[in-house]
């Protein structure tokens, strides 16, 4: 007789989820010569029992503690970079500027990007068909809580000047409600950090318009400033040559506006 | 608010060197392109080159070529501007100065105070 | 490399009236250019950029226009502050010239 079985309003976890945290953390740690010591299957084994027979809707920060102590890992803290809605550009940034680092660019980051993940209560199976959205179900999720686990460290080791790539297309560039605006932006530890400088990545080629004067960035600001973090803004006008000017700044056309 | 704080005027021998530095107080530095203008008493204004301080990227005047070294220190937001073989002609008041951007847009928004350096034997 | 050239070298006007400065590129530098005010003793303080964008700060009263080879930074009613060295700037071409500046005095 087939088990009824929860019915969640987001995607089931994602296909072959073992086989994946299991290959990417066997090619991260070979091409990261500072995390070769890391136990791959260890690592899965604490990935698993995280979320692994507990209900998708009560998971905490403590479930995923075990996966944090085998994924610690230093990152240079003044070489960290954020990003809110927009994180094709700060991967591509980061994979040309390769002393900066994105949270996916760190072991666990790298992990779990992409990825969705559910089990079910007081059973070992993974659930494939649906997991819980974290608007339409609940927040406590095994993939939110994960997110907002490594989000929280991530921004608690950053120090000195802390970047963040914004997206300037969408209605609310700095948004209070996503990762970066309720998690990473309140774990920023002042005696640590100097200035949080944002950029503002621009959409369209002929917008020239101050972005850096957007109501939402200088609530940003705002929030930042009553942290005692200095607040820094820029507008990445035109975020295809900002890209090849990292690659190749001796580049003509960076040595030149033509 | 974000400063250029320069370093205080020096007297020099000519054939000697110069470096003055440029630090960046209260902001930040790396991903901005640092200029160096000079302008000697009663003159115009002149650009030496540039550094991007997270690229480590120099550019230089072809009439500076080879006299003039520009370095930056990120961990201390720090930009130097080394002259050699310094000449009387030298004689000038040198500014640092930085762009917003170092790919797009390279107007300079932000000026230091100004190093005085006398060439002079 | 591009030369910048601006007139005239001295403009002497009364506090109140406008002041109306040149500068012309030896070539085209698109609308890569930015006007810098400079008084005795004092740090190049940025004005216009892209011709014709005041920076932050900048009073109304200053505005710039032109593109190509052709541009105008106009000074709508003079205050007594306002008188000082003028340079243009093209960011357009390595290496980036300045115009020779233009003075602007009290009548």
């Known amino acids: 007789v087939p088990r009824w079985r929860q019915q969640w309003s987001g995607p089931g976890t994602t296909k072959r989820f073992p086989e994946t945290v299991l290959a990417r953390c066997v090619k991260y740690t070979e091409i990261h010569p500072e995390m070769r010591h890391v136990d791959c299957q260890s690592v899965w084994d604490a990935f698993k029992g995280a979320f692994i027979s507990k209900h998708p809707c009560n998971i905490t920060e403590e479930d995923y503690q075990p996966l944090m102590k085998l994924g610690t890992q230093t990152v240079p803290c003044n070489k960290i970079l954020l990003w809110s809605r927009i994180k094709d550009l700060a991967h591509q940034f980061t994979q040309v500027q390769r002393d900066m680092f994105t949270l996916e660019d760190t072991l666990l980051g790298y992990l779990a990007d992409d990825l969705t993940w559910c089990g079910e209560f007081n059973t070992s199976k993974i659930n494939y068909q649906s997991c819980p959205d974290w608007r339409k179900d609940c927040s406590n999720n095994p993939v939110s809580v994960f997110w907002k686990t490594v989000s929280r460290r991530f921004a608690e080791a950053a120090c000195d000047v802390v970047h963040v790539m914004l997206n300037g297309s969408r209605s609310k560039i700095f948004d209070k409600n996503s990762t970066f605006g309720s998690v990473e932006v309140h774990n920023l530890q002042p005696e640590k950090v100097q200035t949080l400088e944002a950029w503002v990545i621009h959409g369209g080629r002929e917008d020239s318009r101050d972005l850096c004067q957007d109501p939402t960035i200088k609530e940003l600001e705002s929030i930042i400033s009553k942290r005692n973090i200095q607040f820094s803004c820029k507008n990445i006008y035109r975020p295809d040559k900002f890209l090849q000017c990292v690659k190749n700044p001796e580049d003509s056309s960076c040595t030149s506006e033509i | 608010q974000v400063q250029l704080v320069q370093s205080g005027a020096e007297v020099k021998k000519p054939g000697s060197s110069v470096k003055v530095s440029c630090k960046a107080s209260?902001?930040?530095?790396?991903?901005?392109?640092i200029s160096w203008v000079r302008q000697a008493p009663g003159q115009g204004l002149e650009w030496m080159g540039r550094?991007?301080?997270?690229?480590?990227?120099?550019h230089y005047a072809q009439k500076f070529q080879g006299r003039v070294t520009i370095t930056a220190d990120e961990s201390t937001s720090t930009a130097y501007m080394e002259l050699s073989s310094l000449r009387s002609e030298d004689t000038a008041v040198y500014y640092c100065?930085?762009?917003?951007?170092?790919?797009?847009?390279?107007?300079?928004?932000?000026w230091g105070q100004g190093t005085l350096v006398t060439v002079s034997s | 490399e591009i030369v910048m050239t601006q007139s005239p070298a001295t403009l002497s006007v009364s506090p109140g009236e406008r002041a109306t400065l040149s500068c012309r590129a030896s070539?085209?530098?698109?609308?890569?250019l930015a006007w810098y005010q400079q008084k005795p003793g004092q740090a190049p303080r940025l004005l216009i950029y892209?011709?014709?964008t005041r920076a932050t700060g900048i009073p109304a009263r200053f505005s710039g226009s032109g593109s190509g080879t052709e541009f105008t930074l106009t000074i709508s009613s003079l205050q007594s502050e306002d008188f000082a060295v003028y340079y243009c700037?093209?960011?357009?071409?390595?290496?980036?010239?300045f115009g020779q500046g233009t003075k602007v005095e009290i009548k």
């Open positions: 100065a930085r762009s917003d951007s170092f790919y797009y847009a390279y107007y300079m928004d932000l």
């Open positions: 209260g902001g930040v530095f790396s991903y901005y392109t």
């Open positions: 550094i991007i301080p997270s690229l480590g990227a120099t």
């Open positions: 070539q085209s530098v698109s609308s890569n």
């Open positions: 892209g011709a014709s």
């Open positions: 700037q093209q960011y357009n071409n390595w290496p980036w010239t």
